[in-house]
């Protein structure tokens, strides 16, 4: 009975669409065949769910339709992208992966990646 | 405010039966797991259940395993836990526990009150 | 299952005065661990997560440290509202196990 670990990147800088990716790589104590991936953001203390995606192994993510969460999965591993960020969205997104069957559970949170927003600068209006 | 509220309580016969409920608010109520926690008189806490999200996974502890079922109407915004075949050691103070976001129970119900006697 | 052993059973001491707490786990529970302060007729209340986190509106005398099998709980500068019994518990796998509890009393 050991405790899962999570790794994820410390920084990522978000593209100029507010597009950022990540890997989240949790090392499985047992063989999971049903995992759930949940994505916390963690600024000034407060902590809110960003998305959250149950997945069966050997399948893809399923995140509801309307979230700003994609991803895929490949064995211990799973590629996160979030969309449509802003630069009020800058903080810390936790990766959290829980090992919901078969017995037993287990939980598993990474240290957090630091997401950098930066709003692009307006197209200046062009005289020609 | 964010909070759950047990019922269901009271004096039954070993060997019967009594479903507790255990009603949230204040928060989004299909995104967090759920547990039983049971405290009997004078005594520590003991874990005794939990059920995940959308209701299909669950988990009990040894000792209720087999007698004790786990449920949740996320429509109604409601846990509960089906109680069979009591015993006298069941006796307890049932409380509802939340699975917070980094996983310890940051929110408890006052709880209920299950005395099984004959 | 993971056993949680916390000592002393009884801590008796004056208000103002420092606590100090400990659980040790059978076998390693990572940071995965939290704390409960519990008074008389009241539910448990989340004090401290992942070994070192407090909880929101936990007042900063409550800290605590260690991760693997052995963790302590600190109260300084004990306030009136602060006797009662708290309980360590693991949540990083199933089952979930608690300390049996430390009661700290006014000497």
């Known amino acids: 009975c050991k405790a899962m670990h999570v790794a994820q990147p410390a920084v990522v800088l978000a593209s100029s669409r507010g597009i950022a990716s990540f890997v989240c790589e949790y090392a499985s104590p047992g063989k999971a065949t049903e995992v759930r991936v949940t994505v916390l953001r963690q600024a000034d203390s407060q902590v809110t769910e960003v998305c959250a995606a149950t997945y069966m192994m050997g399948n893809e993510l399923t995140f509801l339709d309307d979230s700003i969460c994609t991803g895929t999965s490949s064995g211990n591993q799973v590629n996160l992208t979030i969309q449509g960020l802003r630069a009020m969205d800058t903080g810390l997104y936790i990766c959290k992966v829980e090992l919901m069957y078969p017995p037993p559970y287990y939980l598993g949170i990474g240290n957090g990646t630091q997401i950098y927003v930066i709003d692009p600068e307006p197209c200046p209006d062009s005289d020609f | 405010q964010v909070q759950l509220v047990e019922s269901g309580g009271g004096v039954v016969q070993p060997g019967r039966s009594l479903r507790l409920s255990c009603a949230a608010s204040g928060f989004t109520f299909s995104s967090y797991g759920i547990h039983w926690v049971r405290q009997a008189p004078g005594k520590g806490l003991e874990w005794v259940a939990v059920i995940w999200y959308g209701g299909n996974n669950k988990y009990y502890a040894d000792s209720v395993k087999g007698r004790f079922t786990i449920s949740r109407d996320n429509s109604k915004n409601t846990l509960y836990l089906q109680m069979n075949s009591l015993r006298a050691e069941d006796t307890a103070l049932y409380h509802c526990?939340?699975?917070?976001?980094?996983?310890?129970?940051?929110?408890w119900g006052q709880g209920t009150m299950v005395t099984v006697s004959s | 299952e993971i056993v949680l052993t916390q000592s002393p059973g009884t801590l008796s001491l004056s208000p103002g005065e420092r606590a100090t707490l400990s659980c040790r786990a059978s076998q390693s529970v990572s940071s995965y661990l939290a704390w409960y302060q519990q008074k008389p007729g009241q539910a448990p209340r989340l004090l401290i997560y992942g070994a070192s986190s407090r909880a929101t509106g936990i007042p900063d005398r409550f800290s605590g440290s260690g991760s693997g099998t052995d963790f302590i709980l600190t109260i300084n500068r004990l306030e009136p509202e602060d006797f009662a019994v708290y309980y360590c518990?693991?949540?990083?796998?199933?089952?979930?196990?608690f300390g049996q509890g430390t009661k700290v009393e006014i000497k």
């Open positions: 526990a939340r699975s917070g976001n980094f996983g310890a129970f940051d929110i």
């Open positions: 518990q693991h949540y990083g796998n199933s089952p979930w196990t």
